[in-house]
């Protein structure tokens, strides 16, 4: 990671030596590098109880580089920060903290939510569903003949899965009772039950009340972790595809 790493080359004067290795400009037998060659960063490395000076081409993780007229120095990021751009801006927080505009927080501000994978405060994503598809044909036990009452269903797609704090998806399946024109079943279509049913008098004013499918209600209640993984990816695909038009298709 850090190519130019220099320490003292051989035993010289115990304090300062000019015969330094690699990136060191000056070094001491005991403290390692004291100053670095141009463009290299000076950092202190802890070895046991002692700190040794090293010269690096870039600062290690957990440190940021500052260029001064006389020295380029690596400085440690704040305690809650894993990697930082400078002393004011963290780019990755330590476990248990969430990144919001360069700072590490215990909790995210209102209107944002904690993403436990990226350890960032991110936008809350609500569920988005398409419009309903047309109702299916009216059927009873998979048949469209030989009965008066049956059920029909319609479905819609989830365009955007919600994030952990997002609104849950509404049902994606709907079933309602329906009536069909009395129609003779073709040979081989009709079963015993079909013949019995045929004799029943038609029921006037049949209800067509839609009932959300219990299966679809369950499927919309995914656990937050499952939702969170998929949502960023799907959102990006939908938005990038639609470019300058709104991605919402909920009406």
């Amino acid at each position: 990671q850090n190519a130019s790493r220099g320490r003292r080359q051989r035993r010289m004067h115990p304090n300062v030596s000019q015969g330094c290795q690699g990136g060191c400009a000056t070094c001491s037998d005991y403290n390692g590098c004291l100053s670095c060659k141009p463009r290299l960063f000076f950092a202190l490395e802890r070895i046991g109880m002692k700190q040794i000076g090293v010269c690096l081409s870039s600062c290690p993780s957990g440190y940021y580089g500052t260029r001064y007229p006389d020295i380029n120095k690596c400085t440690k990021c704040k305690a809650d920060c894993d990697t930082c751009f400078n002393k004011n801006f963290c780019t990755k927080c330590k476990s248990g903290f969430y990144l919001h505009l360069g700072k590490c927080l215990d909790n995210c501000p209102e209107g944002l939510e904690a993403n436990n994978h990226t350890m960032e405060c991110v936008s809350i994503v609500h569920c988005e569903v398409s419009e309903w598809n047309p109702w299916s044909p009216c059927t009873k036990k998979g048949k469209t003949c030989g009965f008066k009452r049956g059920t029909e269903t319609r479905v819609r797609e989830i365009i955007q899965h919600p994030s952990a704090k997002g609104n849950l998806c509404p049902p994606t399946n709907e079933t309602r009772k329906c009536t069909v024109q009395r129609k003779k079943c073709q040979k081989g279509e009709r079963g015993k039950k079909g013949r019995e049913r045929k004799r029943k008098k038609p029921n006037k004013g049949e209800s067509k009340e839609a009932i959300p499918d219990s299966k679809s209600l369950e499927s919309s209640k995914e656990i937050p972790e499952q939702r969170e993984n998929k949502q960023q990816q799907k959102k990006r695909k939908v938005q990038d595809k639609q470019k300058s038009v709104s991605v919402s298709t909920v009406h």
């Epitope: 505009l101 501000p109 944002l112 991110v122 960023q232």
Partner: antibody, heavy 117, light 107 residues
């Protein structure tokens, strides 16, 4: 160096949609933090409208939530504002801006939009 | 929404003077507050972020301070280019609201 440039029609009729584009140069919109739309009304009052973040997710000002949409085209490095059902109250100078780690905040020059019949 | 109350709404000062503009928030914004300067016909320019960090290229005559719900921007030794409008904005909870602005005029 990063630059943002707003473009779009200067005049929009009431009840129509206002559509603006922010073209970004010198930085990828998939790398930045938050790509915002902000407007300034004739009396100089500023209003944050919303953003699209680097990962394509949005946040909008609740006062505009039913009318606003911010989308993007990553191949063109542009992001867009669409404001529906405009009224004369939406007459303002519209700015796009970005919040970045390195620069923290940069604004475009702004584009004036008048809503009038 | 967090309300931002900026004061004074306007002030007149002479070149060389020191002025202070304040911004009070209806609830804590945890130092996620920025100050902007806007000259006539131009877009706002960032001066200070995280309440007290000076943005790149901004004169050290500007300084931000405060915490919780009270923040201020101090301008030492006013220069002709400092005149114009000043705004505070928070970046805490959504929506990120602005203060009403302070118009700084030459006396």
């Amino acid at each position: 160096q990063i630059q943002l440039q707003e473009s779009g029609p200067g005049l929009v009729k009431p009840s129509q949609s206002l559509s603006l584009t922010c073209s970004v140069t010198g930085y990828s919109i998939t790398s930045g933090y938050y790509w915002n739309w902000i407007r300034q009304f004739p009396g100089n009052k500023l209003e944050w409208m919303g953003y699209i973040s680097y990962d394509g997710t949005n946040n909008y000002n609740p006062s505009l939530k039913d009318r606003i949409s911010i989308t993007r085209d990553t191949s063109m490095n542009q992001f867009f504002l669409k404001l529906n059902s405009v009224t004369t109250e939406d007459t303002a100078t519209y700015y796009c801006s970005v919040l970045l780690i390195q620069y923290f905040n940069i604004w475009g020059a702004g584009t004036t939009v008048t809503v009038s019949s | 929404d967090i309300q931002m109350t900026q004061s004074p709404a306007s002030l007149s000062a002479s070149v060389g003077e020191t002025v202070t503009i304040t911004c009070r928030t209806s609830e804590s914004v945890n130092n996620f507050l920025a100050w902007f300067h806007q000259k006539q016909g131009k877009s706002p320019q960032l001066l200070v972020y995280h309440a007290k960090t000076l943005a790149d290229g901004v004169s050290s005559r500007f300084s931000g301070s405060g915490s919780g719900t009270q923040y201020s921007l101090k301008i030492n030794s006013l220069q002709p280019e400092d005149f114009g409008n000043y705004y505070c904005q928070h970046f805490w909870s959504i929506p990120w609201t602005f203060g009403g602005g302070t118009k700084l005029e030459i006396k």
